[in-house]
C-alpha cells in the first residue's frame, strides 16, 4: 500500500516522493533498504534527500533499488518505499512499455495532456513535445505551462507523447523525459462564455477591522472537462502577486467542481488583518476561457462588530 | 468552516459499551495532514485526551484506556465513531470530538460536547 | 506520561492588570526544534477554545492581550490587559509524546 514504483533514464535527473504523506513540520530520513544506511541530505552528493523527496542529480544504473522514507511526527513513524528503477537509454526511437506513464484520453474538445511527474521539479518553460520522437511543430500545438494543448485532434493525434524539460538545482542543469501514450475519444461537452456564480455583480461585504475575510470568485464554463478556463482576482485592476501587498494573497490552486455537471472553478481571496485602506479598494473576480472575459466588482465595507463584553 | 458535532447516548449501564459518532464538515479525513481526536471531561475535573486517528488511518490511543478504546472513520460520511467497553459510573463526562490541524499537531476545533452518564 | 502541572490553581486579577499562568512539563516537549505545548480557554458550558499553539503563537481571531511563552519544559500563558470576560479556566496541553496530556487547569476569577 505504501511503496511506489519510480523510473528513470541514465544520466537524466530523477526526483521521488514519499509515499507517505505528512505535515511540513514532520521530518523525512531517508535509506538505502538493502543496508539501511542513511542516505545524505547535502546536496554536493549525487543521490541525496530533501524532505519528502529522494534527488538522483543525475541518475545511474547503479541506483536502481528500494529505497525506505520515514517520516517523523512527533508521536509515531510512517514508513514508506520507492521502488526506483534506472535504465539505460535507447538507441532508437521506440519507447519500452516500462519507461511509459498512464495513458491519457482526449476529445476535440479537451486535448490536455500533461507531462508526468513535472511538479517534482525545478523547471522553466517551455516544455519541448515530441510525438514518437519527432519534435512537435505548427500552430496546432501549443505548449501551456506543464501540457500540451493540440487544437482540434483528430484520430491521427493518437500516440506516444514525450515531454523533455530541464531540471534546475543550484545552477546545475539537468535533462528530464517522461512518455505517456495518448488516445482519442468522442466527448459530448461544450464549453460557454464564463458565468459568475458568486460574487454579485457590485456586491458590498462587510467586514471587520482587524479581522480575516475571505472572498471566494466562482465560475462555471461549460460541460466536460475544460481547458485554459480560469478564475482569479484583481485588485484594483491590478493582478495579486504584483499589487504587493502579503496580507492578501489568492489561494493556491483552483478547485474545479462540477455541479450539476458543469464545470466550475473557484478561487479565494484571503484578506488577513483588515485595515482600512482595503475599504478604498476595488476588487475583481475574473473569469476567463477561450470564449472570453466577464468580470464582477467587489467593494468592502465595515461591519461594526458587536460588543461581546460584560 | 471547520464544524464538528457529538452525537450518541446521553445514560449507559455499567458494563454497557458506549459508541460515540463524531460527524464533522469544513474538512477532508482524506487530506493529508488531517486529524480528529476524541477528549472527555468529567464533571469539574481536567480534560483527558482518549484517542484520535489520522488521515491515512493510523489510530493512536491513551495507553491507560487502549484495551478498551477503538476509533473509526468513514471518509464519506465524514465521520469518526469511538466505542468504549465496560462502562464504570467514572467515566461519567462531557466527550468532546475534535479536530486536529496546522502545521503541527494539535487541537484547533472542537465540537461542543456530549454528555455521558454512566448509572444503572 | 508527560505530567503537566500549572500554577496557580486558581487567581483573581483586577480588570486591567496582567495574569500570568504558567505550566511545567515533567520532561521536554521539544521536537525539531519547536515546543508543542497549547493553551485553551473554556468558559462554563463550553468547550475548549485554542488561544496558543506551539508555546507563542496566538491563533487567529484571538485578541493580542494572550500571549504565550517559553520553552522546554517551562511555558507561561499571559493575559495583558486582562478584562471582565477572561473569566474562565486555562488549560496547558502537549503533543510531543502520546498520550497527550492536560494541565489540571487555571481558574482565573475577576477581583
Known amino acids: 500500500k505504501f511503496s511506489k514504483q519510480s523510473w528513470g533514464l541514465e544520466n537524466e535527473a530523477l526526483i521521488v516522493r514519499c509515499p507517505r504523506q505528512g505535515k511540513p513540520s514532520y521530518t523525512v530520513d531517508w535509506y538505502y533498504s538493502q543496508t539501511n544506511k542513511s542516505i545524505p541530505t547535502q546536496e554536493r552528493n549525487r543521490v541525496f534527500a530533501s524532505g519528502q523527496l529522494l534527488k538522483f542529480l543525475p541518475a545511474a544504473v547503479a541506483d536502481s533499488g528500494i529505497y525506505t522514507c520515514i517520516v517523523r511526527s512527533p508521536t509515531f513513524n510512517r514508513t514508506g518505499y520507492a521502488n526506483v528503477t534506472i535504465y539505460k537509454k535507447q538507441s532508437d526511437c521506440n519507447v519500452p512499455d516500462y519507461l511509459m506513464y498512464s495513458t491519457v484520453s482526449g476529445s476535440e474538445k479537451n486535448s490536455k495532456i500533461y507531462c508526468p511527474t513535472i511538479d517534482l521539479y525545478n523547471w522553466t518553460a517551455p516544455l519541448e513535445w515530441f510525438k514518437n520522437c519527432q519534435a512537435l511543430q505548427g500552430s496546432r500545438y501549443r505548449a501551456h505551462k506543464s501540457f500540451l494543448v493540440i487544437d482540434n485532434v483528430m484520430t491521427e493525434d493518437a500516440g506516444d507523447y514525450t515531454c523533455k524539460f530541464i531540471h534546475n538545482e543550484n545552477g546545475a542543469n539537468y535533462s528530464v523525459t517522461a512518455t505517456r501514450s495518448f488516445t482519442v475519444k468522442d466527448e459530448q461537452g461544450f464549453s460557454l462564455f464564463p458565468v459568475i456564480g458568486a460574487p454579485a455583480q457590485n456586491e458590498i461585504k462587510e467586514v471587520e477591522i482587524g479581522k480575516n475575510a475571505n472572498l471566494t470568485c466562482s465560475a462555471c464554463f461549460g460541460k466536460g472537462t475544460q481547458f485554459l478556463a480560469a478564475v482569479l482576482w484583481q485588485l484594483n485592476g491590478t493582478k495579486i502577486t504584483d499589487f504587493g501587498e502579503p496580507r492578501i494573497q489568492q489561494e493556491e490552486g483552483q478547485n474545479q467542481s462540477f455541479s450539476n455537471g458543469l464545470a466550475c472553478l473557484d478561487m479565494v481571496l484571503r484578506i488577513a488583518d483588515v485595515k482600512e485602506e482595503d475599504l478604498l479598494l476595488q476588487y475583481d473576480c475574473l473569469a476567463l476561457n477561450l470564449h472570453g472575459l466577464r468580470r464582477h466588482t467587489v467593494r468592502l465595507s465595515r461591519k461594526n462588530p458587536i460588543d461581546h463584553h460584560s | 468552516q471547520v464544524t464538528l458535532k457529538e452525537s450518541g447516548p446521553t445514560l449507559v449501564k455499567p458494563t454497557q459499551t458506549l459508541t460515540l459518532t463524531c460527524t464533522f464538515s469544513g474538512f477532508s479525513l482524506s487530506t493529508s495532514g488531517m486529524g480528529v481526536g476524541w477528549i472527555r471531561q468529567p464533571p469539574g475535573k481536567a480534560l483527558e485526551w482518549l484517542a484520535h486517528?489520522?488521515?491515512?488511518?493510523?489510530?493512536q490511543y491513551n495507553p491507560a484506556l487502549k484495551s478498551r478504546l477503538t476509533i473509526t472513520k468513514d471518509t464519506s460520511k465524514n465521520q469518526v465513531v469511538l466505542t468504549m467497553t465496560n462502562m464504570d459510573p467514572v467515566d461519567t463526562a462531557t466527550y468532546y470530538c475534535a479536530h486536529i490541524g496546522g502545521d503541527y499537531d494539535y487541537f484547533d476545533f472542537w465540537g461542543q460536547g456530549t454528555t455521558v452518564t454512566v448509572s444503572s | 506520561d508527560i505530567v503537566l502541572t500549572q500554577s496557580p490553581a486558581s487567581l483573581a486579577v483586577s480588570p486591567g492588570q496582567r495574569a500570568t499562568i504558567t505550566c511545567r512539563a515533567s520532561e521536554s516537549v521539544e521536537y525539531s526544534g519547536t515546543s508543542l505545548m497549547q493553551w485553551y480557554q473554556q468558559k462554563p458550558g463550553q468547550p475548549p477554545k485554542l488561544l496558543i499553539y506551539?508555546?507563542?503563537n496566538v491563533e487567529s481571531g484571538v485578541p493580542a492581550r494572550f500571549s504565550g511563552s517559553g520553552s522546554g519544559t517551562d511555558f507561561t500563558l499571559t493575559i495583558n490587559p486582562v478584562e471582565a470576560n477572561d473569566i474562565a479556566n486555562y488549560f496547558c496541553?502537549?503533543?510531543?509524546?502520546?498520550?497527550?496530556?492536560f494541565g489540571q487547569g487555571t481558574k482565573l476569577e475577576i477581583k
Open positions: 496541553q502537549q503533543s510531543r509524546k502520546v498520550p497527550w496530556t
Open positions: 486517528i489520522w488521515w491515512d488511518d493510523v489510530k
Open positions: 506551539v508555546a507563542s
